[in-house]
């Protein structure tokens, strides 16, 4: 999917006001310096498909990251704010719907929500050069 | 099956407010994008905007920004549609409008329609 | 906002007629057309979405085709029913818009 056409000022808004406090809520108890940004992103549209890969793509280690409320209000916010999105990712998520998983909390899935947090903060300053 | 119900016709006056409903039924209404669209009389259709009833999260078309206020209540599976300043260019049929697949902003299920008047 | 221009605004056929009704867009909008009925009093019908994809329960004499700009919705043999309003819309970008409609009027 092509982020480009994304109201980036309404999702930005969306993940000030909430979606930030539920990434931060997951990762209680976690120090901020554990885990090393290895994931970087250079404009928006390239954030939020970054994003959108280490939120909704099961990888080794975890798979169940969908189901969080980051997760869910991620996908609503996409599906709002960037028209066409929710019709990409119809067989996706039916299939995530189908798999209700019980959620683990592995520090590989802390790990990869960490990434999340440096993507949504380079989301959020789409003016500063690449480090 | 799902179904959307709607509210009655309303006449408004110039400079006033209307508050149109749409109850869904037949599904969960959580996680399913309900837009509103309207067609004046003899007109083509016009998207007005579009609520993520789950987290309230809210789009509208940049004609309608500041007159329009779309709102949900989950408890009740309602969708309101809110348009104030009203003038007569304003008469329509409202409709509001939902897909059958998450998230998706296809509009597969429509209410009846609401007919709004707006005349002195 | 993309413009969504239909032709023709109206025609006239006969039952068992091919009909072609065109839609184009003021840039491009990748597959992202959907197309709805509207019979008089009623609200819109989704037919077709993905520019070609028909919908659940909806009749295969319709079809769509057409990305990036040109997009064409056929009905292989028309029926008594299918007298009605057709509307191409776009999905691609924010506000979602609609062409003018095209009516199909009985011959």
């Known amino acids: 999917y092509d982020f480009t056409n994304c109201d980036f000022e309404k999702i930005k808004a969306a993940y000030l006001s909430t979606i930030s406090k539920d990434l931060i809520t997951y990762m209680s108890g976690t120090k901020s310096t554990e885990f090393n940004n290895t994931v970087s992103c250079s404009n928006r549209p390239h954030c939020l498909t970054e994003i959108q890969s280490l939120t909704f793509n099961p990888t080794a280690g975890c798979a169940s990251l969908a189901k969080e409320m980051f997760a869910m209000k991620t996908k609503a916010a996409l599906a709002i704010w960037c028209p066409g999105y929710s019709e990409t990712q119809i067989n996706a998520t039916q299939a995530m719907k189908k798999r209700r998983k019980r959620k683990v909390t592995t520090n590989k899935c802390l790990e990869q929500v960490s990434q999340l947090q440096g993507l949504w903060r380079r989301f959020n300053r789409p003016l500063l050069k690449q480090q | 099956q799902v179904q959307l119900v709607q509210s009655g016709a309303e006449v408004k006056k110039p400079g006033s407010s209307v508050k149109v409903s749409c109850k869904a039924s037949?599904?969960?209404?959580?996680?399913?994008?309900i837009s509103w669209v309207r067609q004046a009389p003899g007109q083509g259709l016009e998207w007005m905007g579009h609520?993520?009833?789950?987290?309230?999260?809210?789009n509208y078309a940049q004609k309608f920004q500041g007159r329009v206020t779309i709102t949900a209540d989950e408890s009740t599976s309602t969708a309101y549609m809110e348009l104030s300043s009203l003038r007569s260019e304003d008469t329509a049929v409202y409709y509001c409008?939902?897909?059958?697949?998450?998230?998706?902003?296809?509009?597969?299920?429509w209410g009846q329609g609401t007919l709004v008047t707006v005349s002195s | 906002d993309i413009q969504m221009t239909q032709s023709p605004s109206s025609l006239s056929a006969s039952v068992g007629d091919r009909v072609t009704i065109t839609c184009r867009a003021s840039?491009?909008?990748?597959?992202?057309l959907n197309w709805y009925q509207q019979k008089p009093g009623k609200a819109p019908k989704l037919l077709i979405y993905?520019?070609?994809s028909l919908q659940s329960g909806v009749p295969s004499r319709f079809s769509g085709s057409g990305s990036g700009t040109d997009f064409t919705l056929t009905i292989s043999s028309l029926q008594p029913e299918d007298f009605a309003v057709y509307y191409c819309?776009?999905?691609?970008?924010?506000?979602?818009?609609f062409g003018q409609g095209t009516k199909v009027e009985i011959k």
């Open positions: 037949g599904g969960t209404f959580s996680s399913y994008a």
């Open positions: 993905g520019a070609s």
């Open positions: 409008a939902r897909s059958g697949m998450f998230y998706s902003i296809l509009f597969d299920y």
């Open positions: 609520i993520s009833p789950e987290f309230g999260f809210t």
């Open positions: 819309q776009q999905q691609n970008d924010y506000p979602l818009t």
């Open positions: 840039q491009d909008i990748y597959n992202y």
